[in-house]
């Protein structure tokens, strides 16, 4: 008897495998099933050759399937959704010439550390590019030029350093753009263009405000009400513009907005200071003592959000007006964590120091690297339920300047994967990410013994993001207790990766529990979680983080 | 013009089992798909099972294991075996026809009772 | 699964009066790939087998006379008889084809006063 789920949604065949322990498709498919979805699923390689017969095939959804390898070697012209994230994918093949139709391509949380410059060739009617929370350091310059059609695209929680230059260019349609939670200190010079860009998340970066950032500061001043911070379970088109959350990582954490450059050379001194052919540079903007120029707010008619992927409430290097307890983001699971010291050099992304070596004094100017480990760290798997560390003593943790809260995970109110009704767990509108069974115990998060003291946040926390480029230290030594460091933060600059001036010392700080396991939003409203590789705090990366 | 006409209902005991048949024509049986609607005596209408032109089967949870649903596209025949009947299960059981891949029923037959009881 | 719930139950008209006929779906029927609303209507006259008034919310079937119209959106639909004639008694059903299992509302009984 075939051991999957069948239904129709909107006139098409619809077939629920999600979590069935296969480890290849299963026998008895429907030659006319137009939504196949495969899910939480062993399947480790798969093939699109296997779906050959599946004419109809519409919708394929191979998320959290353990896929180390995803081979597009077989037709499927009618293929408009494909959902490969929380796999182990490293890279992703040319997906043009097999599938032609594909108008959603999800490949999030997924461990891809470069795309090649051929990757969306022949997608020309691609509408959504999803790559958050992956390893992407750079991108290719001329990547999207086959993809006339994007409308929404998700660069969130990577390591960018840097953006091409003409990469939006062609992208018309493109209403959507998150690139928050990356590694980027500036925009190149004319990057939005002339698009309209009603929703544009950029928090979350070490914005380094010097001459260079002049561009960025003078879009989003232009832009002011297209700028949001992410919300977990809150559509864009939802949640109230933000263009405060874009801040200054090395000058006075102010918002970029405001930075005004005043040492710069202006255009009459022979600088190039041209904003897209803005010419009035003689307004002045309340409370800052520099130029600045009239508002000019785009808006646009496409207005529709992916809440497929939750992104992550509060920006990573600093919120406004807030103290931040900046938590170390992607920690291994290791006896001990390493700590640098407090004697703290400038603030900015330095190389990561390989773990076999001491280590160095490094310079603030230096592109952000992270070495490969030389032996695979030890990660758990896909199905493991998430594990929330024990404190073994009351929190220890800096006092802050600000009211001190204890921040709770928030569950949406609704269940925001499903915009169709009738489809749970089949097909919401364009794609969606297909509902995950509930553990046989919920995971609990065991409150301390003594309330531990935390800075006020406006509301409360998700995960946190990264909070800079990570240095990241990987451990030779397989891992085992959970024990996580938790660094506050007493002034409002922004923590970055110090430079070292002596060598990393190791202790022993248990993590605040209730900060140990914030699952999304998405996971928070099943009562369930994905695998611990999928959240940051058991990540391969160790970042550290002290006060000044 | 589009005939379909039911038959196999009767009386059978709890537990039991019974094949229903419809027969089809005025129409290009293969390349529609059909269904089964019931309605027990005074009440509503409740859909029992669908068959694809492609020939797959779907269900909902009331009948799923229960109910069996199949077609002989050479005989333009529409079939329902149904297992392990219950009281509840007593209706005019209808067969009829989609157009194409829609989910709306277009043309419907006269109906075969079925009665559960002991 | 979608529930759908249709009001009045019953409905006494007088011929060459208008009628009309509401039915709400617990969940929304638009599709907002095609904007289509996959909502049909059935009259089932005294004695015989259901038969198609209109599919996807509006669009009536060959043969069904233009005083039957359908409109609405999302999960509020309406049914409407302009004027109606003493052949049009019966039930009246609506169903969803949004998605499987497909469900009928309660069905709304028209009768002549």
């Known amino acids: 008897e075939f051991i999957c789920e069948v239904s129709k949604v909107t006139s098409q065949v619809e077939v629920n495998c999600d979590n069935k322990g296969l480890k290849a498709l299963p026998p008895g498919l429907p030659g006319d099933t137009a939504i196949l979805h495969l899910a939480e699923n062993p399947l480790g390689a798969f093939s699109t050759a296997l779906l050959g017969p599946l004419t109809r095939l519409a919708q394929l959804h191979l998320r959290q399937s353990q896929l180390t390898q995803l081979q597009v070697d077989g037709m499927l012209p009618r293929l408009e959704t494909l959902d490969v994230s929380h796999n182990r994918l490293k890279s992703l093949p040319s997906l043009g010439r097999a599938l032609p139709a594909l108008t959603t391509l999800d490949a999030s949380f997924n461990e891809l550390v470069a795309l090649s410059p051929g990757t969306l060739d022949g997608l020309s009617h691609l509408h959504e590019l999803y790559l958050r929370g992956n390893k992407l350091k750079t991108l290719p310059p001329r990547l999207l030029a086959p993809t006339a059609q994007l409308r929404k695209l998700n660069l969130a929680d990577n390591r960018l350093t840097e953006l091409p230059p003409g990469f939006l260019e062609g992208l018309g349609e493109l209403d959507t753009l998150y690139l928050q939670g990356n590694w980027l200190r500036t925009v190149p010079k004319g990057f939005f263009g002339d698009l309209l860009l009603p929703f544009t998340f950029l928090h979350g970066n070490p914005w380094s405000c010097d001459c260079e950032i002049l561009y960025l500061a003078r879009w989003l001043r232009d832009n002011s009400n297209n700028v949001y911070l992410w919300k977990e379970g809150v559509e864009a088109k939802a949640t109230t513009p933000n263009v405060d959350s874009v801040r200054c990582v090395n000058w006075k954490n102010v918002p970029v907005h405001t930075y005004q450059g005043k040492d710069c050379p202006s255009p009459m001194d022979g600088g190039d200071m041209d904003y897209d052919n803005y010419d009035d540079e003689d307004e002045k903007l309340p409370g800052v003592e520099a130029p600045a120029t009239r508002a000019v707010v785009s808006f646009s008619t496409h207005t529709k959000a992916h809440t497929t992927h939750w992104g992550l409430l509060y920006p990573t290097f600093a919120y406004p007006d807030h103290q931040m307890a900046y938590l170390s983001s992607t920690l291994e699971l290791t006896e001990k964590q390493t700590m640098f010291p407090s004697t703290l050099g400038p603030i900015m992304p330095t190389t990561t120091p390989e773990p076999t070596t001491p280590p160095t004094t490094l310079e603030p100017t230096t592109t952000p690297t992270t070495p490969e480990p030389t032996t695979p760290p030890t990660t758990l798997e896909p199905t493991t339920t998430p594990i929330t560390p024990e404190p073994t003593m009351p929190p220890t943790t800096l006092e802050p300047t600000t009211t001190p809260i204890t921040p709770e995970p928030t569950t949406p109110s609704t269940t925001p994967t499903t915009p169709q009704p009738a489809t749970t767990p089949t097909t919401p509108q364009p794609a969606t990410t297909p509902t995950t069974p509930q553990p046989a115990t919920t995971p609990t998060t065991p409150q301390p013994t003594t309330t531990p003291t935390i800075p006020e946040l406006p509301t409360p926390p998700t995960t946190p993001e990264p909070t800079m480029p990570p240095t990241t230290l990987e451990p030779t030594t397989t891992p085992t207790s959970p024990t996580t460091t938790l660094i506050l933060s007493e002034s409002n600059t922004f923590l970055g990766i110090p430079e070292l001036t002596s060598p990393c010392t190791t202790s022993e700080y248990p993590i605040v529990p209730s900060l140990v396991h914030l699952p999304e939003a998405h996971e928070v409203a099943r009562g369930t979680s994905d695998s611990s590789r999928n959240h940051r705090l058991f990540n391969p990366d160790l970042c550290c983080l002290l006060p000044l | 013009q589009v005939q379909l006409v039911e038959s196999g209902g009767g009386l059978v005991k709890p537990g039991g089992s019974l094949r229903l048949s419809c027969a089809a024509s005025?129409?290009?049986?293969?390349?529609?798909?059909m269904s089964w609607i019931r309605q027990a005596p005074g009440k509503g209408l409740e859909w029992v099972s669908s068959?694809?032109?492609?020939?797959?089967?779907y269900y909902p949870d009331s009948v799923l294991g229960r109910f069996t649903i199949s077609r002989d596209n050479a005989k333009n025949s529409l079939y329902l075996q149904m297992n392990s009947l219950r009281a509840e299960d007593t209706a005019v059981y209808y067969c009829?026809?989609?157009?194409?891949?829609?989910?709306?029923?277009?043309?419907w037959g006269q109906g075969t009772l079925v009665t559960v009881s002991s | 699964d979608i529930v759908m719930t249709q009001s009045p139950l019953s409905l006494p008209v007088t011929p060459g009066e208008p009628a009309s006929i509401s039915c709400k779906s617990s969940?929304?029927?638009?599709?907002?790939?095609?904007?289509?609303?996959?909502l049909a209507w059935y009259l089932q006259k005294p004695g015989q087998s259901p038969q198609l008034l209109i599919y996807f919310t509006s669009t009536r079937e060959s043969g069904v006379p233009d005083r039957f119209s359908g409109s609405g959106s999302g999960t509020d639909f309406t049914l409407k008889i302009s004027r109606v004639e003493a052949e049009d008694v019966g039930v009246y059903y609506c169903?969803?084809?949004?998605?499987?299992?497909?469900?009928f509302g309660q069905g709304t009984k028209v009768e002549i006063k």
């Open positions: 009829a026809r989609s157009r194409g891949y829609e989910d709306y029923f277009d043309y």
């Open positions: 068959i694809t032109s492609a020939g797959t089967p």
């Open positions: 169903q969803q084809h949004y998605s499987s299992p497909w469900t």
């Open positions: 005025g129409f290009t049986f293969s390349s529609f798909a």
């Open positions: 969940q929304s029927l638009l599709n907002s790939r095609n904007q289509k609303n996959y």
